[in-house]
């Protein structure tokens, strides 16, 4: 693995990184020293290779010469050839590998299994939440807060093809325009993806399987975040994916069909099934505003009910409000009718552990969570691990080139479409595109599918699994019919106009640059996948709903400085880039700012000390507080007394001056504290701060 | 067997109240409505309000409100009628009656009657 | 208030003869009228109730019929023990009305 992991792949010079870094450096390459560059004024400058404190942090990177930690690793064969195998070796090498192939099968089983029991208990755990968001038809016109609550919900039940049934369900019922559903449903898309980023957080043992998994799960984040960027406001001013989708509506008939196959289902329901079986109906009644079913649990006791339609008679406000004038009377008290109900009659519990136990949703949610979390990170353990095993030497060359080579010229371009697909098909055979690119995940990591590759299986699955919505809409029953289809069609759109937004123009392919970015981020500060997941996902969803909540005004009034100061960055990094003299000095560069600001070190500082705090039996919260403040406001040679007795044998000294206690250590601090603030990065020809500046 | 045992005859001076209990026996009370009907001497019958025994919910009939009260103990199985304000044209056979409630199957059982007879 | 006519107000009839007592409401009842009969020095007893179903333990010569607004109670052959007052009932909304009563005599 290369020093700078987050440096990797920034330029395609991998030597030119510092221009102007005053003083000696004690680890320039010999090979280096002496070499001469101009700067932007013209005065030659020593080429400098950099030190971990002068890392650069960017989202936007070109691939470098030499060692690249994207180049796909060479899974070499360490075992003896076939050639040198006696028969009996022979013989229990084929057993061997019969052996592992079943392994293999029952793991990847297990992973299916446990990522729909994940579903399950991230709905028992928000689904009720989750329909009550729902239920605010108000903010939902809102197209902002319809696309949060899309993103929240999708979350929240780890499904979006549940919440595209709930927003059917409105739909039909008239509870929600086509026009309102939109933004929700390319909130679902955006929700659906954050599972392979979980899936990819389960990779975080080697740094650049990491790094590769982390951003082959997020190029499908980035794909869908960029996509809403672009079409959420082109849709809310022309409303193009209604008007196409009624176009499309009314140019053919549409009559029921058959409902996609469950292949998947059909293998992985007879196990999850004794798991846990729930009542998706209810998150639906929820949305559509049943107060009852709020009490109600998700969990499914009874699995084999008989319906009776009975006559009952019920009390109405007033004769007027009879069903029929022959049925209608009075007791003196109450008037009375009488109604068609239809009773529901349990013949046979279901067959899961938790139909017995009186255990609130929430508890059972939690216990699933943890359980299949656990199941989730031990079968991606044994996967990659066998994986790693089977895929060596030959093996591995074939597999590799089969899924990663292009068609010979002038056919190339061609590969990236027969990928989607490829992923689409796919998708349509699993049923779900959670599913797929969950499995294509750990393939990422250990480098048998590249992020160019993957980048369209995952667009692929995106249509895959709208085809699916599509069919199981033509199998809708006839009320639902329309309105399903017609979400089901925005939905296929909406991805194919992300896909020609992303895809055919390499330069437009922004996604794999940005998940590698993140990736390289991800890779030397591993808490930052799961600040990104969480501010991502949850944070910023949540922010902009409690606004919406609070209105139109109050919405724009916070949104509008945040995203002008946002673009105002990037013109600013545009300018740093490209034309820096027209800058004045001061703005050529982040130094101006507070190094938190503009670095993840001293919140890396800030983390590593909070968690070797946690883990300590007793945590010195002064000295600790203390370090805080040094690294926060950029001093680096402070001194923090000890305030107490600690208890660790490394620390006896009775002062010590504040070291970084990140993941790497930083032999360049030292450094820093003499010539902080001198440090430049150049990166695409940007100039940007060091020390992994996220400008 | 259902019965409805109304209290005795009672002879009230104007101005003053009569309360007439009605005990039942012999059917769950509380799925029952109990209805108060009088007759006055040579008259028809004449509804004066029901009670849910249930739930205590009452209604009456627009020209006894206010002047009536129906309750109900449901330890006893017992129903009361208390009639205020009393005037001569109040004299009459007051009935409590029963109804199954949510049923449409009217006053299927009525009490003997208890006489009131309102004179100075 | 619903207001319920009853015809006649009496009548004298002979044992075995065939009774018809009417009753009309005011406005539209549906099939909510019942029919009570009340022996001299007795309390009411019900017969028919939903304008046409006999109370358990109802002699079936007394057949109720009608709907909406027009009903009558036939006593298809009258014994003696018939001798009473009956009144109709409609309970389509409160408050429960009755008609005024149809007296029954045997010559």
């Known amino acids: 693995m290369a020093p700078w992991p987050e440096l990797e792949n920034a330029h395609p010079n991998p030597n030119k990184f510092i221009e102007g870094a005053s003083g000696p450096q004690s680890s320039i390459p010999d090979k280096d020293k002496g070499t001469s560059k101009t700067n932007d004024s013209g005065t030659p400058v020593a080429k400098i290779e950099l030190l971990p404190s002068y890392s650069a942090l960017v989202l936007i990177e070109e691939p470098p010469e030499g060692n690249d930690p994207w180049d796909l690793p060479e899974l070499q064969d360490n075992g003896i050839k076939w050639s040198e195998r006696d028969s009996k070796g022979k013989i229990l090498c084929i057993f061997q590998g019969i052996g592992k192939f079943i392994l293999l099968l029952g793991f990847l089983y297990l992973f299916v299994c446990s990522l729909d029991v994940l579903s399950s208990a991230f709905q028992l755990v928000g689904g009720k939440m989750a329909g009550q968001f729902f239920s605010n038809n108000s903010i939902m016109s809102n197209p902002v807060a319809g696309l949060v609550i899309g993103v929240l919900v999708t979350v929240m039940v780890q499904s979006s093809s549940t919440s595209s049934s709930i927003i059917v369900s409105m739909v039909a019922s008239s509870l929600l325009s086509v026009r309102a559903a939109i933004p929700i449903i390319m909130g679902a898309n955006i929700g659906t993806s954050i599972t392979n980023t979980i899936v990819a957080l389960m990779q975080a043992g080697d740094r650049n399987e990491f790094r590769r998994a982390f951003a082959g799960a997020t190029v499908h984040d980035f794909f869908n975040w960029l996509s809403v960027l672009v079409l959420l406001p082109l849709e809310a001013a022309t409303h193009y994916l209604e008007k196409l989708t009624n176009l499309v509506l009314e140019t053919f008939s549409f009559q029921n069909g058959e409902d996609a196959p469950d292949i998947l289902k059909v293998i992985t329901d007879p196990f999850t099934k004794l798991i846990i079986q729930l009542d998706k109906k209810v998150i639906q009644q929820i949305a559509m505003g049943d107060s009852e079913a709020q009490n109600k649990s998700l969990i499914k006791i009874w699995c084999k009910t008989i319906s009776n339609v009975i006559e009952e008679n019920v009390t109405v406000p007033s004769p007027d409000n009879c069903t029929s004038p022959s049925y209608c009377w009075t007791d003196g008290i109450q008037t009375w009718t009488i109604q068609n109900v239809t009773e529901k009659e349990n013949i046979a519990k279901c067959q899961h552990i938790f139909v017995n136990f009186s255990l609130p949703d929430l508890a059972v949610g939690i216990i699933l969570l943890t359980v299949s979390l656990l199941i989730l990170c031990g079968c991606l353990i044994m996967i990659v691990k066998l994986l790693g095993s089977v895929l060596r030497g030959q093996v591995a060359t074939v597999i590799k080139k089969t899924l990663n080579t292009d068609f010979p010229f002038p056919f190339a371009w061609l590969t990236g479409y027969l990928a989607i697909l490829v992923g689409a098909g796919m998708t349509f055979i699993v049923q779900s595109s959670s599913v797929f690119t969950s499995a294509m995940t750990p393939l990422i990591g250990i480098g048998v599918i590249s992020i160019e590759r993957a980048y369209p299986l995952t667009l692929g699955s995106n249509i895959g699994t709208t085809t699916t919505a599509i069919l199981a809409a033509l199998a809708s029953p006839g009320n639902t019919l329309r309105s399903s289809l017609q979400i089901a069609l925005c939905h296929f759109f909406f991805n194919i106009s992300g896909i020609l937004l992303w895809y055919p123009i390499p330069f437009t392919r922004l996604p794999i640059r940005l998940a590698k970015g993140l990736g390289n981020i991800s890779a030397k500060y591993r808490w930052f996948a799961v600040f990104y997941l969480i501010f991502f996902f949850l944070l910023t969803p949540l922010t902009v709903f409690g606004l919406s909540l609070a209105g139109w005004p109050v919405l724009v009034g916070v949104g509008v400085p945040i995203i002008l100061l946002i673009l105002l960055v990037l013109c600013l990094r545009m300018l740093q880039a490209r034309c820096p003299r027209i800058l004045p000095l001061k703005l050529r560069d982040w130094n101006f700012l507070p190094l938190w600001m503009h670095s993840l070190k001293p919140w890396d500082n800030i983390i590593s000390l909070a968690t070797s705090c946690f883990q300590r039996r007793c945590c010195c919260c002064c000295r600790v507080c203390c370090r805080v403040c040094c690294m926060v406001c950029g001093c680096k040679c402070c001194r923090c007394s000890k305030c107490c007795k600690n208890l660790e044998e490394e620390e006896k000294e009775q002062d010590v001056p504040v070291k970084a206690s990140g993941g790497f250590d930083n032999t360049a601090m030292s450094k820093e504290c003499q010539d902080e603030g001198k440090g430049q990065v150049e990166v695409l020809g940007m100039k940007a701060l060091s020390n992994t500046t996220v400008f | 067997q259902v019965q409805l045992v109304q209290s005795g005859a009672e002879v009230k001076k104007p101005g003053s109240s009569v309360k007439v209990s009605c005990k039942t026996s012999g059917f769950f009370f509380t799925e029952y409505i109990i209805h108060w009907v009088r007759q006055a001497p040579g008259q028809g019958l004449e509804w004066i309000g029901g009670?849910?025994?249930?739930?205590?919910?009452?209604n009456y009939k627009q020209n006894f409100r206010g002047r009536v009260t129906l309750t109900a103990d449901k330890s006893t199985s017992t129903a009361y009628m208390e009639l205020s304000s009393l005037r001569s044209e109040d004299t009459a056979v007051y009935y409590c009656?029963?109804?199954?409630?949510?049923?449409?199957?009217?006053?299927?059982?009525w009490g003997q009657g208890t006489t009131v007879t309102v004179s100075s | 208030d619903i207001q319920v006519t009853q015809s006649p107000s009496s009548l004298s009839t002979s044992v075995g003869d065939r009774v018809t007592i009417t009753c009309t409401a005011s406005q539209d009842v549906g099939t909510a009228v019942a029919w009570y009969q009340q022996k001299p020095g007795k309390s009411p007893k019900l017969l028919i109730y939903?304008?046409?179903t006999r109370h358990t333990g109802v002699p079936e010569r007394f057949t109720g019929s009608g709907s909406g607004t027009d009903f009558t109670l036939t006593i298809s052959s009258v014994q003696p023990e018939d001798v009473a007052t009956y009144f109709c009932q409609q309970y389509r909304t409160s408050p429960l009305t009755f008609g005024v009563g149809t007296k029954v005599e045997i010559k």
């Open positions: 939903w304008a046409s």
């Open positions: 009670i849910i025994p249930n739930n205590d919910v009452t």
């Open positions: 009656a029963r109804w199954r409630n949510a049923y449409y199957s009217a006053m299927d059982s």
